[in-house]
């Protein structure tokens, strides 16, 4: 099924994400005690570290090309607040499209 196929993509994306976060932390002078939001892999896509008040935008992740190969990919955002990251806006399905009736094969 498509979800099983996505596992390999995710492992590769996650490894790339952790490298990206490390580089971004060095560039921005971020460490564990820095105010702001640490970079993270949320099991769907990669979010770079951000300062409080910053909005981070990402393109829809690769997973949704499997769900909807013909769909133009949208954009998802998270806000970095004093309490940490907000949840994605819009949620992934709303931003990236989801065909409820597409087969799983």
């Amino acid at each position: 099924g498509s979800m099983a196929h996505s596992d390999g993509i995710f492992k590769k994306e996650q490894a790339m994400c952790l490298e990206k976060i490390q580089r971004a932390n060095e560039l921005m002078g971020f460490n564990d005690s820095s105010p702001g939001c640490p970079g993270m892999w949320d099991n769907i896509t990669c979010w770079k570290p951000a300062h409080v008040g910053e909005m981070v935008l990402v393109s829809c992740p690769e997973l949704f090309r499997i769900f909807n190969p013909d769909q133009d990919m949208g954009v998802v955002s998270r806000n970095c607040t004093e309490d940490g990251w907000s949840e994605p806006f819009p949620h992934y399905f709303d931003a990236c499209g989801f065909d409820e009736y597409e087969s799983e094969t």
Epitope: G1, M3, D42, N43, I44, L63, F67, N79, T81, D83, S86, E87, P88, F89, P90, H91, Y92, F93, D94, F98, E100, E104
Partner: antibody
């Protein structure tokens, strides 16, 4: 059509455990996040927990953290809520709901609920 | 956690009247605010998503507005089947939360 059927509710003594199940049909269960939401008799809705499509992300309300565990079996199209150290204030109708997302999302379809009564 | 406050707690109106329900968040939730209707003995039903987006199958008399901390659900002309409890729900910050509800009853 989307159908969610909860089971496993009942009367239980304080401090004991109970496991709720939610059988899903009418949609591709393995692609959606799932929520548990509860409603005490005559009261409002209280969000309890959510689990991502693959079970990799789980989040809980403060009131149940450390006592309740959300899980899923995608091969059986079933969502679970393991409830330990139950208290009188956990007495409620427990709804399972589909989250319109892979990660969390907002509940878009709901079951009819299963009643949990915690009483000595 | 983000606390949602709904007002009024009860709204007594007659069929045909306009209903205006308010939901206020203790911190900004952007537009990640959703509205549900619950009738006695039934599960909640999603009415409006992302503050103002309508859903297929939901009558056009239901509309939503707002962003940040202040939101409104409007029922333009109450039908007998609209008398119910209405809840707002935020999915902007974990843990997610619901408002305490507004009961719309018949005057």
């Amino acid at each position: 059509q989307v159908q969610l059927v909860e089971s496993g509710g009942g009367v239980v003594q304080p401090g004991r455990s109970l496991r709720l199940s939610c059988a899903a049909s009418g949609f591709t269960f393995s692609r959606f996040a799932m929520h548990w939401v509860r409603q005490a008799p005559g009261k409002g809705l209280e969000w309890v927990a959510v689990i991502s499509y693959d079970g990799g992300n789980k989040y809980y309300a403060e009131s149940v953290k450390g006592r309740f565990t959300i899980s899923r079996d995608n091969s059986k199209n079933t969502l679970y809520l393991q409830m330990n150290s139950l208290r009188a204030e956990d007495t409620a109708l427990f709804y399972c709901a589909r989250g319109y997302d892979v990660l969390t999302g907002y509940p878009d379809y709901w079951g009819q609920g299963t009643l949990v009564t915690v009483s000595s | 956690e983000i606390v949602l406050t709904q007002s009024p707690a009860t709204l007594s109106l007659s069929p045909g009247e306009r209903a205006t329900l308010s939901c206020r968040a203790s911190k900004s939730v952007g537009r990640s605010l959703h509205w549900y209707q619950q009738k006695p003995g039934q599960a909640p039903r999603l009415l409006i998503k992302y503050a103002s987006q309508s859903l297929s199958g939901i009558p056009a008399r239901f509309s939503g507005s707002g962003s940040g901390t202040d939101f409104t659900l409007t029922i333009s002309s109450l039908e007998p089947e609209d008398f119910a409890v209405y809840y707002c729900h935020q999915s902007s910050r974990l843990p997610f939360t619901f408002g305490p509800g507004t009961k719309v009853d018949i005057k």
